[in-house]
Interface confidence: low
């Protein structure tokens, strides 16, 4: 069966070769071919070329439509890694380092502390905060991590919060908090993470991260 296919392929290839050779001879004006025959072969060839070009145009149109569709609803995602900071601020600092994600300029990390989106929509926003604390060395208050939102023209608000009591382990016990939820964000909205004691946050690889994904 395969042999028959191979013979068919070779026959087609031979026919194509003969056809191209005939066009060549028509172009060089060989007298052995009648003018009528040449006109027929040329129009046949032009037909082939036209078909190929039309096919190409259609493909181009389809591709450009795909691109437009993609442009209208591009993937927006970010994942940033914690950064130790000398600042005493309760807002955690982040960096585009390690295995980070920043899909495009529709989401940006501003001042190393907040993720800002340029398009309105529903976003899944998450943060993981790992901290190491000790009951004796810490205040009575629990360690609290808050995911906060600042929208243009509006004041800051808390979207999610989680609290953990301090460990009795010495020198300190590692614990992780995970926050995650779906929220509607306006263009220019920023999200950031606040903690009660940034000095207790663990910045080792994979321990503390922050991100969002447009749904």
């Amino acid at each position: 069966h395969r042999r028959l296919d191979k013979i068919e392929d070779e026959r087609n290839l031979h026919e194509d070769f003969v056809f191209m050779k005939t066009i060549q001879r028509c172009n060089t004006g060989e007298r052995s071919l009648s003018l009528l025959n040449c006109e027929e072969i040329k129009s046949q060839f032009e037909g082939f070329v036209k078909d190929i070009m039309l096919n190409k145009e259609e493909t181009k149109k389809e591709n450009s439509f795909e691109m437009q569709k993609g442009d209208q609803n591009p993937q927006i995602a970010a994942h940033v890694i914690s950064e130790a900071s000398s600042k005493t601020t309760s807002v955690l600092q982040w960096a585009e380092k390690g295995y980070y994600t920043m899909s495009n300029n529709l989401v940006t990390l501003e001042n190393g502390k907040q993720l800002t989106v340029k398009r309105q929509g529903l976003y899944y926003i998450y943060a993981q905060v790992t901290f190491c604390s000790n009951r004796e060395a810490s205040s009575q208050a629990p360690f609290i991590a808050s995911l906060c939102l600042k929208s243009p023209g509006r004041f800051e608000r808390i979207l999610l919060r989680a609290a953990n009591t301090h460990s009795s382990a010495k020198p300190c016990g590692q614990q992780s908090i995970h926050l995650g939820g779906v929220f509607e964000l306006q263009p220019g909205a920023s999200v950031f993470v606040n903690v009660t004691d940034p000095s207790q946050v663990s910045h080792g690889t994979g321990f503390t991260s922050f991100g969002l994904l447009k749904l």
């Epitope: 208050a141 609290i144 808050s146 509006r154 004041f155 608000r157 808390i158 919060r161 009660t196």
Partner: nanobody
Framework: EVQLLESGGGLVQPGGSLRLSCAAS????????MAWVRQAPGKGLEWVSS????????YYADSVKGRFTISRDNSKNTLYLQMNSLRAEDTAVYYC?????????WGQGTLVTVSS
């Protein structure tokens, strides 16, 4: 109907103190995070401080950290802002604000002028 009424503003010398109050009505005060926002003459709105519903956590703008203290008394439906070590740049209309889902509720504001 949500109502927020600020009081306690006035003229004070640099380095002085003031305590602003905000009486809230028309909603369950103890369920909501509250905030103070200010608008200096000819400038935009600036978030100053916010406090969680039960008062357990407070947040401050860097410009007021260490000088201002936000607090609340849920039994009296009242929000407070204690302002110490006042500076000329703290001159503004101070608004008490409550977050809504699609927009924020504001009071009428109280004017604080810091001048010698």
């Amino acid at each position: 109907e949500v109502q927020l009424l600020e009081s306690g503003g006035g003229l004070v010398q640099p380095g002085g103190s003031l305590r602003l109050s905000c009486a809230a009505s028309g909603f369950t005060f103890s369920n909501y995070q509250m905030a103070w926002v200010r608008q200096a003459p000819g400038k935009g709105l600036e978030w100053v401080s916010s406090i969680t519903s039960e008062g357990g956590s407070t947040y401050y703008a860097d410009s007021v950290k260490g000088r201002f203290t936000i607090s609340r008394d849920n039994s009296k439906n009242t929000l407070y802002l204690q302002m110490n070590s006042l500076r000329a740049e703290d001159t503004a209309v101070y608004y008490c604000a409550k977050p809504g889902k699609n927009f924020d509720y504001w009071g009428q504001g109280t004017l604080v002028t810091v001048s010698s």
